[in-house]
């Protein structure tokens, strides 16, 4: 079931997945001057079985300039403005991604992407707060949210992270060392 | 208590364009996206995308992506959905509902018909 | 993109009835959401999350189902069950809704 709204911002700090429960969905966007190739992926979808999941689909883009009736996908210049706040961050590529049951890893780029990425979250998605550079994470609790469900409505969880204006920048979980995080929660209502 | 309320019914030529409006009520609006939904004269709902009032985000139903633009006015609490290029199968109520989950709210709906 | 059946289209009962409305996904989905409209109304959420009843619905009414085949159920038709009904998902975008079921008077 997909997240209806979008993980909290928190002050001077950044989130992002550090795997992509299945169902997430991540647009095909391209950078500017190219487009979507015709009868391309609007999407590209992570799905699996018990075993294994893998994202559906690739992102292909293509020069804006061969002439092609499809309609631009690279969003024009006020529309540029707009996106890059939206859903998730710049797609980087975690240093570590436990290989979660029923979780896709972050997807390689594609040629002329764009240089945002916007996911569409599923419940139960997990995402990881740090503070940008030149901040420093005073932790309450977890540095994480989590998309949940109640009564039909989405919702994430709020994450407990301050982000204070001190130079040293605190790590997302897996950037010092291996570990599972508790991401593959049950997709289910929570109880009302 | 939270409310929609869409603006009045529309008689548009074709190849003209109408702009629908959805003023929200009783809710934080910049909280929750706004979907707008069609229903053609004796047809099924069909989802014609969203908006974040919070950011000006949009994402679309392939389909109607060269018909519907959606906007929204932060400061007002409303939702505007413009359909340009009227033609005859444009015809329909047009409905905004709330999203950030399932559609609980609904606005009354908008006839917009289209006819030379 | 998901394409969502209801069987049937239209369903001829009468007051006292159980009525039972299907809906198969052409893809499994988490859950199913059902609406009820009346003419020249707009749709009234009526079932959440595939068994959940929305707030004010009356427990004569009931829904089930997983993967792909989901079912909505009316225990005992009233006057005022008289209506179009529409299974809607939303796991996937584009979201998608049935073609709907007319519950009519036999």
């Known amino acids: 079931e997909l997240c209806d709204d979008d993980p909290p911002e928190i002050p001077h700090a950044t989130f992002k997945a550090m795997a992509y429960k299945e169902g997430t969905m991540l647009n095909c966007e391209c950078k500017r001057g190219f487009r979507r190739i015709k009868s391309g992926s609007l999407y590209m979808l992570c799905t699996g079985n018990s075993s294994h999941s893998s994202w559906d689909n690739q992102c292909q883009c293509t020069s804006s300039a061969t002439r092609n009736t499809t309609k631009q996908v690279t969003p024009q210049p006020e529309e540029q403005k707009e996106r890059k706040t939206t859903e998730m961050q710049s797609p980087m590529q975690p240093v570590d991604q436990a290989s979660l049951p029923g979780h896709c890893r972050e997807p390689p780029p594609w040629e002329n992407e764009a240089t945002e990425r916007i996911y569409h979250f599923v419940v139960g998605q997990m995402v990881y707060y740090q503070c940008v550079q030149g901040y420093r994470a005073l932790h309450r609790g977890p540095a994480e949210s989590v998309c949940k469900m109640t009564h039909g409505k989405t919702r994430w969880t709020q994450p407990q992270l301050i982000c204070t204006g001190e130079m040293e920048t605190s790590q997302f979980p897996g950037e010092e060392k291996p570990q599972a995080s508790p991401e593959g929660r049950p997709e289910s209502e929570t109880s009302c | 208590q939270v409310q929609l309320v869409q603006s009045g019914a529309e008689v548009k030529k074709p190849g003209s364009s109408v702009k629908v409006s959805c003023k929200a009520s009783?809710?934080?609006?910049?909280?929750?996206?706004m979907h707008w939904v069609r229903q053609a004269p004796g047809q099924g709902l069909e989802w014609i995308g969203y908006i974040k009032p919070s950011r000006g985000y949009t994402e679309y139903n392939q389909k109607f992506k060269d018909k519907a633009t959606i906007t929204a006015d932060k400061s007002t609490n409303t939702a505007y959905m413009e359909l340009s290029s009227l033609r005859s199968e444009d015809t329909a109520v047009y409905y905004c509902?709330?999203?950030?989950?399932?559609?609980?709210?609904w606005g009354q709906g908008t006839l917009v018909t289209v006819s030379s | 993109d998901i394409q969502m059946t209801q069987s049937p289209s239209t369903l001829s009962a009468s007051v006292g009835d159980r009525v039972t409305i299907t809906c198969s996904a052409s893809?499994?989905?988490?859950?199913m959401h059902w609406y009820q409209q009346k003419p020249g109304k707009a749709p009234k959420l009526l079932i959440y999350t595939t068994s959940n009843l929305a707030s004010g619905v009356p427990a004569r009414f009931s829904g089930s189902g997983s993967g792909t085949e989901f079912t909505l159920t009316i225990s005992s038709l009233q006057p005022d069950d008289f209506a179009t009904y529409y299974c809607h998902q939303r796991s996937t975008y584009p979201l998608t809704f049935g073609q709907g079921t007319k519950v009519e008077v036999k």
């Open positions: 893809s499994s989905i988490s859950y």
């Open positions: 009783g809710y934080t609006f910049t909280s929750y996206r």
């Open positions: 509902a709330r999203g950030g989950g399932v559609f609980d709210y």
